[in-house]
């Protein structure tokens, strides 16, 4: 037995993190995002579950909905109508995929304090929303869209062809939800609620993924999802717009697809209303290096939508795919025709451009060897955006304001010096006309949310400072974190290293690489987290490293597009290169190095283990992709092209985990997957296991019955406990 060294009395009262701390969420933090309802008011659910309206200007708060009313229907969410006469209450939440869920909705009349009776909403509803003005309701039920002029009115049925797993109206199918829209909805009200635009997805010809859901019955259920894998038939999308004032008059009108897009397979990527009679649609070729932004106008005489070729703006990438993870969306200015948009400049960095007539004549608003990440708001005189410019750390996010009313436009960093040590990674949420905004700081210190004046940027009040968390952490020995970079062959590899609390450079530590590494991802971020790897450093004395290699985002197109058409090569190489550099630092025990990852990270960790370098003793892959032929078309083809002979089939075949089965012989491999994974199908791990068995390679595996890609609930506890045992065994750490 070794007595623990006592440095001082204070340190003696400190304790290391435990796995239980992590699994119980003991050190989780809170953020505060105001639910803005005007320029100076927001709604917030109080600790005792009342819905409270705050007026910033007067400092007053009003309970608009009591917890009693919420509880009467077991409501877990709410939505105030813009005329403030009604609230929808959402209950019976039932998750479907990443964003989608069904629920039961009740409408509560605030003027008389009663639930609206008569013409109640059907159940369960797939999506429901208020019009942006007044209290019209649009909702999706059984894949069809319905409209109510007032909550108590009978519904008007807009679509009739909706059919489960075949035709989706106003909601996306699986692949559009996960890989294109990143929403549960596919309908959009015009700014004053005159028109309702919606997408129709026809999945009739899409091949279906089928998997067993074991449940508790004698026979398992089969889950069927139309899911286009790489190269398969894709959904057919159409966009319609209906006049909600007189919905029966002419009915839904289809918006034409630009000719250059319609000539081959294509996607719809987003819709942005500009005014009540002008709409902007974005389309993308199936080979995702050409995107077209089309501005369409309502023709009163014909009651149709006209999209002139002169209002088509083409965005094309010659070095990779169009955009970052998604093609960026435009933010229109007050003239209702010009807009601001983020895309690559001539030097290959994503920056804000102002487009007035043509993309060729775009005026570049930001520039430099860094990237603009998000445009939050454009007002008459200011543009608010986030970037990673400050002090040249790509893993930071600061909020900037550019004055667009003056020439030359002046730029001010709103957040750079607010709480410099504590806060280096921000997002923001703006009220109408950017009269006020909330800043949410995610770290590297304890997260804090603050309210600010939109004109002066003055802090008005702290919305959430996580005091309880701060107090709880006072007697915890947290690991040390550092973010640094490696320069290797003209490539900059940023890394985050998490070091044990009493880290001593003269000692040797086991190293765990945590990898994601997917295209346009970023793992090395200046954010606060107390998670599993924090525990591994704090209690188990491991060094953990995260490395952003080629293919990762926000450092320019050269790094981002390096992996184009070659997934599974450079991401792996860069993890290996980084490990070699870490060994050179002198404090890594090179006989105890492991790698783990989830999803894309599981793919990279598997390939790294099978790289034949002898660097890794063991590793874990959770829900890995094993062949790009098994993954979704929209995602996969964006980066890999098509799995056809005349396109990129060869690399599809070369980049599988199965092709490297033999190389797993000299590593300890733990393969984990949920059997009900709708995203990265269990098929991926089943094929790895089959290849390893056929190669007579020993490995460990764990499946989670009826669990999806997130392995949530009790599975999470089991998963992290199991992985901890595996790593401690691998690193010869006593249990």
């Amino acid at each position: 037995l070794r007595p623990s060294r006592v440095h001082n009395s204070e340190e003696n009262t400190m304790r290391a993190l435990t796995l239980k701390d992590i699994l119980n969420g003991t050190f989780s933090y809170k953020t505060f995002f105001p639910n803005w309802i005007s320029g100076q008011e927001y709604l917030h659910q109080s600790a005792d579950n009342n819905i409270v309206l705050y007026n910033i200007e007067t400092g007053q708060s009003y309970t608009i909905l009591s917890n009693r009313t919420m509880k009467s229907v077991n409501a877990s969410n709410y939505g105030l109508s813009p005329d403030r006469q009604f609230v929808y209450l959402e209950s019976d939440y039932s998750k479907l995929w990443r964003y989608s869920y069904t629920a039961t909705y009740y409408i509560y009349d605030l003027s008389n304090g009663e639930f609206v009776r008569g013409n109640e909403l059907p159940r369960p509803i797939q999506y429901l929303c208020w019009s942006p003005v007044g209290s019209k309701l649009a909702y999706v039920y059984q894949n069809n869209i319905y409209l109510k002029q007032r909550p108590g009115d009978p519904p008007f049925q807009i679509t009739f062809n909706g059919r489960e797993n075949k035709i989706f109206n106003g909601i996306p199918d699986w692949v559009y939800e996960e890989e294109m829209l990143a929403t549960k909805y596919a309908l959009w009200w015009s700014p004053n609620g005159k028109f309702l635009a919606y997408a129709e997805f026809n999945d009739t010809d899409i091949p279906v993924i089928a998997y067993s859901y074991y449940g508790d019955e004698q026979y398992p259920r089969t889950i069927n999802i139309p899911y286009p894998k790489a190269g398969a038939k894709n959904p057919v999308v159409r966009i319609f717009i209906i006049d909600t004032t007189y919905p029966a008059y002419v009915g839904p009108q289809e918006v034409p697809v630009p000719a250059m897009i319609a000539s081959s397979d294509y996607y719809f990527s987003w819709l942005t209303w500009v005014t009540d009679e002008r709409v902007c649609l974005q389309w993308l070729k199936r080979v995702q290096n050409v995107s077209v932004l089309s501005i369409c106008d309502f023709r009163e005489d014909w009651q149709t939508w006209d999209c002139p070729k002169t209002q088509e703006h083409i965005e094309e990438s010659r070095t990779g795919w169009a955009g970052g993870f998604f093609v960026s969306t435009p933010v229109f200015s007050y003239d209702a025709i010009s807009y601001y948009k983020i895309f690559s400049d001539k030097d290959g960095y994503k920056h804000i451009h102002y487009i007035k007539d043509t993309v060729e004549n775009a005026i570049q608003i930001t520039s430099g060897k860094w990237e603009a990440i998000n445009i939050f708001r454009v007002t008459q005189d200011s543009l608010f955006y986030s970037s990673n410019e400050f002090e040249e750390y790509p893993g930071r996010r600061n909020i900037y304001r550019i004055s667009i009313g003056s020439y030359p436009p002046s730029k001010k960093c709103v957040t750079c010096h607010l709480r410099k040590e504590r806060c280096q990674y921000y997002t923001a949420s703006f009220s109408d006309y950017a009269k006020y905004y909330a800043l949410v700081c995610y770290g590297p210190g304890i997260p804090i949310s603050t309210l600010h004046d939109g004109r002066t940027d003055q802090e008005i009040k702290i919305l959430e400072e996580n005091k309880e968390l701060e107090n709880a952490l006072k007697n915890i020995q947290l690991p040390k974190e550092e973010i640094k970079k490696l320069e290797v062959d003209e490539i900059t590899l940023w890394y985050k290293m998490i070091l044990p609390p009493q880290f001593d450079r003269s000692k040797k530590y086991p190293l765990l690489i945590q990898v994601y590494g997917g295209p346009c991802s970023q793992s090395v971020r200046s954010v606060f987290a107390v998670n599993w790897i924090s525990y591994l450093a704090s209690k188990e004395g491991m060094v953990i490293a995260l490395v952003d290699g080629r293919g990762t985002a926000f450092q320019g197109d050269k790094l981002l597009y390096a992996v184009y058409r070659k997934l599974g090569v450079y991401e792996v190489e860069d993890q290996i290169t980084a490990v070699r550099k870490f060994i050179e630092m002198g404090f890594i025990d090179e006989k105890r190095i492991a790698i783990w990852g989830w999803s894309y990270g599981g793919y990279v960790s598997s390939l790294a283990l099978a790289s034949g370098t002898g660097l890794f003793k063991c590793g874990i892959a959770v829900a890995p992709v094993s062949s790009w032929e098994y993954y979704a078309s929209v995602y996969t083809e964006r980066f890999m092209g098509l799995p056809t002979k005349d396109d990129n089939l060869e690399h599809y075949k070369n980049s599988t985990v199965m092709a490297r089965a033999e190389y797993f012989r000299n590593v300890d491999y733990l393969l984990i997957h949920g059997t009900a994974d709708d995203n990265v199908h269990f098929q991926n791990s089943a094929q790895i296991a089959k290849a390893l068995v056929n190669a007579q390679v020993d490995f460990q595996a764990m499946w989670y019955s009826d669990q999806n890609h997130g392995l949530s609930g009790l599975s999470t506890n089991h998963l992290y406990t199991h992985m901890t045992h595996f790593l401690k065994q691998c690193f010869s750490l006593s249990d």
């Epitope: 309206l53 007067t58 005329d83 605030l110």
Partner: antibody
């Protein structure tokens, strides 16, 4: 149901002060603002001031020096006190509810109490 | 203070007619304008708030529109019971101010 009822003296001598009580029912004063508005005979409406949910007040600058509004949440009562009344302060005085659900417009009015300033 | 001007003190109309009352603000009040109806011997009643939102229980013949400085209140088909004085009011900032009122008379 929502009700506001003003009770006042009816007659006030010039240079004296006016006190009116507004008793509300059907809602809580912690959740709504109460405005005071007056209407001289045959004339239009004039906003005097308000008391917010939290107890803060805001007065029309024309009455700032002689007006005070207070309340007792537990008794559901709001009080208006105005000093140094003159004959042109003769009016119907209304207490009126306001709040964010109608964008701080005035959704419920009391029946008003008639105040005559005369010697 | 923001001055609200109702240009017509009186308006004469017939049952079934469409009538519009205008109100002008001395400065931009966004959409923070309300319209009230006051019948003889009664307290005012809220009809329209935030320029265009009809208050609960108000018949749909009453509508409001406008933003910035110019606002309109319309009765699409005047009924005999609509005989009243109509006031506009800005609820944009304190002090809240009212227009002078427009008396609607039935011919």
């Amino acid at each position: 149901q929502v009700q506001l009822k003003e009770s006042g003296p009816g007659l006030v001598a010039p240079s004296q002060s006016l006190s009116i009580t507004c008793t509300v029912s059907g809602f809580s004063l912690t959740n709504y603002d109460i405005n005071w508005i007056r209407q001289p005979p045959g004339k239009g409406l004039e906003w005097l001031g308000l008391i917010w949910t939290g107890g803060g007040t805001n007065y029309n600058s024309a009455f700032m020096s002689r007006l005070s509004i207070s309340k007792d949440n537990s008794k559901s009562q709001v009080f208006l006190k105005m000093n140094s009344l003159q004959t042109d302060d003769t009016a119907i005085y209304y207490c009126v509810r306001g709040g964010p659900l109608v964008w701080y417009a005035l959704d419920y009015w009391g029946q008003g109490t008639s105040v005559t300033v005369s010697s | 203070d923001i001055v609200m001007t109702q240009s017509h003190k009186f308006m004469s109309t017939s049952v079934g007619d469409r009538v519009s009352i205008t109100c002008k603000a001395s400065q931009d009040v966004s959409t923070a304008v309300a319209w009230y109806q006051q019948k003889p011997g009664q307290s005012p009643k809220l009809l329209i708030y935030s320029a265009s939102y009809r208050y609960t229980g108000v018949p749909d013949r009453f509508t409001g529109s406008g933003s910035g400085t110019d606002f309109t209140f319309t009765i699409s088909s005047v009924q005999a019971e609509d005989l009243a004085v109509y006031y506009c009011q800005q609820h944009y900032s304190n002090p809240r101010t009212f227009g002078g009122g427009t008396k609607l008379e039935i011919k």
